[in-house]
């Protein structure tokens, strides 16, 4: 004997987030009389999605005119799909009863899978700066994607990195997923202009991966090299002592001159010159009146860079000897000038 069948022809339907899902259902008979309902999930905890007989379901529209007497098409459309809508949907025929309708037959179910794009990857570096030759960790995070399959790559200046670990969470079934990756990068003195890139590829992106970047300028600290030199000036009783501060990054730098251990002057790097690699040079000088000194003078250039412990370089100024050139540096970057006469 023929009996009503509830046909859900699609075992699965894949829809992009934000789009409309069509869930097809045909009841093969007008007998028995009674409404159709749609549920997500099975069993006592199932969620009512649409009831032909009553209720308000603003996201659901019927494909056919389901209230018409001869209608056997109970397909529905669900608008503005989100990952939270994923699940198995059942079209269920009820037999008219008193006082309540009785479930008569269910379709086999249609699994709705939602394709959701990953969020833009966010790359974060270490909280504190690190110096060249040190290894630092970068993290990359992206959220809200579905299905779970995803590819993540790391690059430094276009070169793919291999030292990284990636996790996709959760491990089990979920409406959407997150990816977290940590890459290790060894810093070099040339990395001020370098970039670390995290690239995420997913089926929803149609071959156009998302990228997150971090500038190593936010991460690296290149400590300065110091050189103190003495140069004569036209006046025979004066000597120019120069402290060349080279190849430092970031710019935050404070320089202190010491005479025989006593603070003479403190200044902050201002008019610096930038090197091609992004590091900075700066120069400070003292104009020393040697006739005012009976004994030799120990001049110290002390530099505190980016809040780190000070580094210093000293120069012994012989006052007994006739001043003569004891060193020179006329490099083009010596544009910063600061004078100090000692009497």
């Amino acid at each position: 004997e023929e009996e009503l069948q509830v046909i859900q022809p699609d075992k699965s339907v894949l829809v992009a987030a934000g789009e409309t899902a069509t869930l097809r259902c045909t009841a093969t008979s007008l007998i028995p009389v009674g409404p159709i309902q749609w549920f997500r999930g099975a069993g006592p905890g199932r969620e009512l999605i649409y009831n032909q007989k009553e209720g308000h379901f603003p996201r659901v529209t019927t494909v056919s005119e389901s209230t018409k007497r001869k209608n056997m098409d109970f397909s529905i459309r669900i608008g503005n799909i989100t990952p939270a809508d994923a699940g198995t949907y059942y079209c269920v025929k009820f037999r008219k009863g008193s006082p309540d309708d009785v479930e008569f037959k269910s379709g086999a179910g249609t699994e709705l899978s939602v394709r959701a794009k990953p969020s833009a990857p966010v790359v974060s570096g270490p909280a504190a700066r690190a110096t060249p030759q040190h290894t630092v960790s970068f993290t990359c995070e992206s959220h809200g994607f579905s299905p779970r399959d995803i590819t993540l790559k790391w690059f430094k200046n276009g070169n793919e990195l291999s030292d990284f670990q990636t996790n996709v969470d959760p491990v089990g079934e979920s409406v959407s997923y997150s990816i977290h990756s940590t890459a290790k990068v060894v810093l070099t003195r040339e990395d001020v202009h370098s970039q670390v890139i995290c690239e995420v590829a997913h089926v929803t992106l149609q071959g156009d991966p998302l990228r997150g970047t971090a500038n190593l300028s936010e991460t690296i600290r290149v400590p300065p090299t110091l050189e103190v030199t003495q140069q004569p000036v036209r006046a025979e009783n004066q000597v120019n002592v120069t402290c060349q501060v080279r190849k430092f990054y970031p710019q935050r730098l404070q320089l202190t001159w010491l005479e025989n251990g006593n603070v003479s002057r403190t200044e902050t790097a201002s008019t610096v010159t930038e090197n091609k690699d992004g590091t900075y040079n700066w120069m400070s000088w003292l104009l020393v009146n040697v006739s005012a000194h009976r004994d030799d003078v120990k001049l110290t250039c002390q530099v505190e860079h980016d809040g780190q412990p000070a580094v210093s370089k000293s120069h012994d100024l012989k006052v007994s000897a006739h001043p003569k050139e004891q060193g020179s540096n006329t490099a083009a970057e010596n544009t910063g000038s600061n004078e100090r006469n000692i009497y």
Epitope: V63, K68, R69, K70, M72
Partner: antibody, heavy 121, light 107 residues
Framework: QVQLQESGPGLVKPSQTLSLTCTVS??????????WSWIRQHPGKGLEWIGY???????YYNPSLKSRVTISVDTSKNQFSLKLSSVTAADTAVYYC?????????????WGQGTLVTVSS | DIQLTQSPSSLSASVGDRVTITCQAS??????LNWYQQKPGKAPKLLIY???NLETGVPSRFSGSGSGTDFTFTISSLQPEDIATYYC?????????FGGGTKVEIK
């Protein structure tokens, strides 16, 4: 008053695909309220229901023909079509398109005049 | 599929006679039954819908009755223009099916 008109080749070779179009005039397919059906009648025999389509594209096909049948709709042209693949001599018949009222009060309330399709090499 | 058995398969009657055709369904189809008239070389024409309702414009000599599995179609006074083949059709179950037809002739 709605009128339906079938069109398509009257002769189809065995193993090929039979293609027919039904043009609806005097009413819009997309206005809803009807299934748009195909029915055939073998020479000197009774009527066989092939299947229907709703303007939204929902279909149902007779299981005896399901693997070979496709019914589609083009609301912009106010037409619906039948494709029957891998035909044999047993598919020789007069093919009718018809309108089936969903509210039950008119049944297949409008039919085309029918077109004879012969399957022969 | 629902089987519809029409009887007789053909009949011959005189003008003015009462003609009765039966249609038996293989199972309960409630009142989801139509009756069609088909004249030679023409498309079927709906006469009766929902087992007993007369389609608009159809002469009142045609009538239908029945529910469940047994249905009857009657022409109360046969007219020459009624020469045709008559079919019952059920729409309670998919696929829709037709009876084998009853050919009505004039004696």
């Amino acid at each position: 008053q709605v009128q339906l008109q079938e069109s398509g080749p009257g002769l189809v070779k065995p193993s090929q695909t039979l293609s027919l179009t039904c043009t609806v005039s005097g009413g819009s397919i997309s206005s809803g309220g009807y299934y748009w059906s195909w029915i055939r009648q073998h020479p000197g025999k009774g009527l066989e229901w092939i299947g229907y389509i709703y303007y939204s594209g929902s279909t149902y096909y007779n299981p005896s023909l399901k693997s070979r049948v496709t019914i589609s709709v083009d609301t912009s042209k106010n037409q619906f079509s039948l494709k029957l693949s891998s035909v044999t001599a047993a598919d020789t018949a007069v093919y009718y398109c018809a309108r089936e009222g969903l509210d039950g009060s008119y049944g297949s309330s409008a039919w085309g005049q029918g077109t004879l399709v012969t399957v022969s090499s | 599929d629902i089987q519809l058995t029409q009887s007789p398969s053909s009949l011959s009657a005189s003008v003015g006679d009462r003609v009765t055709i039966t249609c038996q369904a293989s199972q309960d189809i409630s009142n989801y039954l139509n009756w069609y008239q088909q004249k030679p070389g023409k498309a079927p024409k709906l006469l009766i819908y929902d087992a007993s309702n007369l389609e608009t414009g159809v002469p009142s000599r045609f009538s239908g009755s029945g529910s469940g599995t047994d249905f009857t179609f009657t022409i109360s006074s046969l007219q020459p223009e009624d020469i045709a083949t008559y079919y019952c059709q059920q729409f309670a179950y998919l696929p829709y099916t037709f009876g084998g037809g009853t050919k009505v002739e004039i004696k």
